[in-house]
């Protein structure tokens, strides 16, 4: 909501999760792994990489089925704590200028830092208008104090807020699982909020920094390297 059409393939780590329709976003973090939101879990997912217009075949797409879908063991569907999911692709993505991985964070998100949020979610705060072309939004990371004041009792240490307390610009339904990137690092995953782009109700995002070890351990545990002697 309140964003702009991204320059074509300018967000090369952005993926669309498809189950016959686009239902969530995600981020490519290696040639065979995607990170998304825990609440985006489905038993069958097709990962669509290199997308810009999700309704048109433009020639840069790679459609790869999910081989493994691993939700965080402490995901809580009521509170959306630990709202993170890993998808192993059935075959590695072909990395190129339009499809490439985003780095995991080396430090937690800092208040005031500019970030890029992207997705194919609803662009209206009231009503529905789902875009075909990838939308981008530049937004600042808010302080934890501002975040907690916006959602008293709802914000855990695994969440942070990004956006504008005055409203008007925000992620929305269909953006879940997608990236929040600051300084070339995946800091957040689109998670939840009360409505979209409402005053004093900024978007809430999963704090990826808290899950770097889990991500690395999970990838290692699910990568089968065969050693020949």
């Amino acid at each position: 909501v309140g964003g702009y059409i991204c320059e074509e393939n300018s967000v090369p780590y952005q993926v669309s999760l498809n189950s016959g329709y686009h239902f969530c976003g995600g981020s490519l973090i290696s040639e065979q792994w995607v990170v998304s939101a825990g609440h985006c879990y489905k038993s069958r997912i097709q990962v669509r990489l290199g997308e810009h217009n999700i309704e048109v075949l433009e020639g840069n797409e790679q459609f790869i089925n999910a081989a493994k879908i691993i939700r965080h063991p402490k995901y809580n569907s009521r509170t959306l704590d630990n709202d993170i999911l890993l998808i192993k692709l059935s075959s590695p993505a072909v990395i190129n200028s339009r499809v490439s991985a985003i780095s995991l964070p080396t430090a937690p998100p800092a208040a005031g830092t500019e970030s890029l949020i992207s997705g194919w979610g609803n662009t209206l705060s009231s009503g529905a208008d789902y875009p075909d072309e990838l939308q981008c939004l530049d937004a600042p990371v808010l302080s934890q104090a501002e975040c907690e004041a916006s959602y008293p009792g709802k914000i855990t240490n695994n969440m942070f807020c990004v956006g504008f307390l005055e409203g008007g610009k925000d992620s929305c339904q269909g953006d879940a699982g997608g990236p929040v990137v600051s300084n070339g690092e995946l800091q957040g995953i689109v998670s939840w909020g009360y409505g979209c782009a409402q005053k004093n109700r900024p978007g809430v995002y999963t704090k990826v920094y808290n899950y770097v070890d889990w991500i690395k351990d999970t990838i290692a545990a699910n990568s089968h390297h065969h050693h020949h002697h």
Partner: antibody, heavy 125, light 107 residues
Framework: QVQLVQSGAEVKKPGASVKVSCKAS????????ISWVRQAPGQGLEWMGW????????NYAQKLQGRVTMTTDTSTSTAYMELRSLRSDDTAVYYC??????????????????WGQGTTVTVSS | DIQMTQSPSSVSASVGDRVTITCRAS??????LAWYQQKPGKAPKLLIY???SLQSGVPSRFSGSGSGTDFTLTISSLQPEDFATYYC?????????FGGGTKVEIK
Amino acid sequence: QVQLVQSGAEVKKPGASVKVSCKASGYTFTDYAISWVRQAPGQGLEWMGWISASTADTNYAQKLQGRVTMTTDTSTSTAYMELRSLRSDDTAVYYCARGDEVVGKMTYYYGMDVWGQGTTVTVSS
Amino acid sequence: DIQMTQSPSSVSASVGDRVTITCRASQGISRWLAWYQQKPGKAPKLLIYAASSLQSGVPSRFSGSGSGTDFTLTISSLQPEDFATYYCQQANSFPITFGGGTKVEIK
């Protein structure tokens, strides 16, 4: 395989209540929602309400507000629909149906991919 | 509430015919529409979801199209087992609403 199995037919008197059960199997119950739909004899489909199996959030059809309650028991993967103050025009086949969970900022889509076999409820004095 | 208007209410056709059923929403629902088939005494069965996606196991002679307010279900070559009642359903928002149904009968 994925299936929803409903409780048996009921005959009730006007003013009474009925509680229909819907037991799910073949999938993780809390990853989906359940809708309830009814069909009066010779009529079309009427949506009654929806319940999230993971959060127990509900949304009821306006005309049934105050008379209907939908619940779930995650320990037995069972959904329930209770309808009170029954009238003769509540005579219908009642269906439960599985739909996508709608949580957070995922795309909200309220289709129904798996249906129970139906429970006939007859209200007659 | 979003009203769903289906037409025709009934259609007589022969095996092998192409049958088209339309559904109109009273306001825009993007692609959030489903189509169901129901046979007498049976529960509805999902055919098409998100306006044009074919449900697993459903024959490819069924197809759906449309976006916004106008949607179509097409059966390219009617088979004996396709004689049934078809319903559209808006899957965009609460309250969920169905079309009135289209009965496909043998000519």
